[in-house]
Interface confidence: medium
């Protein structure tokens, strides 16, 4: 590594990042007929333009606007599933419940899911060595600003009943510092969103506590209520059974509480 290169605290750009983004875009547009006219080369060019040659601690939402425009997508506003710290289950759910959407079920979320990227100021290089860490280096890094931008837009688009899946195994079931807590909660539109329904996912098999009474859930309820949005909460005691019942709702064991 050249000595002059800035060393950041986070992992570097994901290997084969450009190829991955382009391939994901092509795959997405094939799977989703309504998006098949998206030009993936232009999407990649816009993605690249958001961070290449820019200082990776000085990225703005404005940098991503060309990409946002190309990735404009209409999802049913009443079928949105937000999540916090429980991505895998949320994605498993929308894979079964095909009419509901997480952010990663949209084109832009799908492109960037689990990837890391950053560039270097005044060079056209992608930095595969290291990228800024949100805590240790800076918050205005390419990855964080991307997710803040797409998450805000996703939340703004939501209407009627919005669902959020929360991880009941964490000390902070609702974390104000998560993307959900810091961005999405504050960008739900009260004139469009009637209710936020939280699904608290239990971790332990024998855990029968009512986690909807958790202090952090009460904090979420307070924030939401102050925004003139109703709040409801459900415990999902058995996530495995929950998924099974989504797949097979006619199953006789699915009438009891899950």
């Amino acid at each position: 590594v050249p000595r002059w290169r800035q060393q950041w605290s986070g992992p570097g750009t994901t290997k084969r990042f450009p190829e991955t983004v382009l391939a994901r875009c092509v795959k997405y547009t094939e799977i989703h007929p309504e998006m098949r006219h998206v030009d993936c080369q232009s999407v990649w060019d816009a993605f690249k333009g958001a961070f290449i040659s820019k200082h990776p601690c000085n990225i703005t939402e404005e940098d991503y606007q060309p990409l946002m425009k190309l990735g404009t997508q209409t999802v049913p506003c009443n079928k949105i599933l937000l999540w916090s710290r429980i991505k895998d289950l949320a994605h498993q759910f929308t894979q079964v419940q095909r009419d509901m959407f997480t952010l990663e079920d949209t084109l832009l979320g799908y492109l960037a899911d689990d990837l890391t990227w950053c560039g270097e100021f005044n060079t056209s290089k992608i930095n595969y060595q290291s990228c800024p860490d949100w805590r240790k280096d800076c918050s205005n890094n390419p990855v964080s600003v991307f997710w803040k931008t797409v998450s805000r837009r996703f939340a703004e688009a939501a209407c009627d009943v919005v669902h959020v899946m929360l991880n009941g195994s964490r000390s902070k079931i609702f974390d104000k510092n998560s993307t959900f807590g810091s961005v999405e909660v504050h960008n739900l539109q009260p004139e469009k969103v009637q209710t936020l329904e939280a699904w608290v996912i239990h971790g332990g098999r024998e855990d029968s506590r009512d986690l909807c009474q958790d202090p952090t859930i009460k904090e979420l309820e307070s924030i939401i209520s102050k925004r003139n949005i109703q709040f409801s909460c459900k415990n999902i005691y058995r996530p495995d059974k929950f998924l099974q019942c989504v797949k097979n709702p006619e199953d006789s064991s699915c009438t009891s509480e899950i």
């Epitope: 382009l22 391939a23 092509v26 094939e30 098949r36 998206v38 030009d39 993936c40 990649w44 425009k69």
Partner: antibody, heavy 120, light 111 residues
Framework: EVQLVESGGGLVQPGGSLRLSCAAS????????MHWVRQAPGKGLEWVAF????????YYADTVKGRFTISRDNAKSSLYLQMTSLRAEDTAVYYC?????????????WGQGTTVTVSS | DIVMTQSPDSLAVSLGERATINCRAS??????????MHWYQQKPGQPPKLLIY???NLESGIPDRFSGSGSRTDFTLTISSLQAEDVATYYC?????????FGGGTKVEIK
């Protein structure tokens, strides 16, 4: 070098069937959507059908819908067009064409074509 | 369906002179700020060959005397200095909406 080689054309009576094949080489076939495009004698080009890389999306021109079936075998790097209930107006040179990698709907490589004649 | 109308049907141009072919779409073929219009060259007895994609992008390996322009419904293919090997029929094609449709072709000959 990208190569697409069509086969299976020939003379068939109206109402008959034919199966066209396209053998692909020189590129990773499973990464690309593929099309069939035809050209009637002395006429222009007409798009017939498309199949995505993993066969998840298939589209047809209205003129062939319900009669033609596009399919592919990625393991064999082959594209197919099953044609049934053939009509005189299906007489044409049939080209298989590779979809441009980054955007649906245009063609960066074409085969030499195979001739289908529907006549009694 | 989007109807593509090419003009003229045929064109005779002297060697070294400019050839201009027009294509008009029956409706807008722009989307996401991109024109989904493409141009192909077909020589007798050969398959078509992609020249220009998305209105103005030159396909790799195509000489730069070929250029494309236009947006929305009106597009132009220009050969800046006609060469003998450019004698062919040229087709425009849109990919903004299914079905994919081609123009009727413009035959370019040497005067």
């Amino acid at each position: 070098e990208v190569q697409l080689v069509e086969s299976g054309g020939g003379l068939v009576q109206p109402g008959g069937s034919l199966r066209l094949s396209c053998a692909a080489s020189g590129f990773t076939f499973s990464d690309y959507g593929m099309h069939w495009v035809r050209q009637a004698p002395g006429k222009g080009l007409e798009w017939v059908a498309f199949i995505s890389s993993g066969s998840s999306s298939i589209y047809y021109a209205d003129t062939v819908k319900g009669r033609f079936t596009i399919s592919r075998d990625n393991a064999k790097s082959s594209l197919y067009l099953q044609m049934t209930s053939l009509r005189a107006e299906d007489t044409a040179v049939y080209y298989c064409a590779r979809n441009y990698v980054s955007s649906y709907g245009y063609f960066d490589y074409w085969g030499q074509g195979t001739t289908v004649t529907v006549s009694s | 369906d989007i109807v593509m109308t090419q003009s003229p049907d045929s064109l005779a141009v002297s060697l070294g002179e400019r050839a201009t072919i027009n294509c008009r779409a029956s409706e807008n073929v722009d989307n996401y700020g991109i024109s989904f219009m493409h141009w192909y060259q077909q020589k007798p007895g050969q398959p078509p060959k992609l020249l220009i994609y998305r209105a103005s992008n030159l396909e790799s390996g195509i000489p730069d005397r070929f250029s494309g322009s236009g947006s929305r419904t009106d597009f132009t293919l220009t050969i800046s200095s006609l060469q003998a090997e450019d004698v062919a029929t040229y087709y425009c094609q849109q990919s903004n909406k299914d079905p994919l449709t081609f123009g009727g072709g413009t035959k370019v000959e040497i005067k």
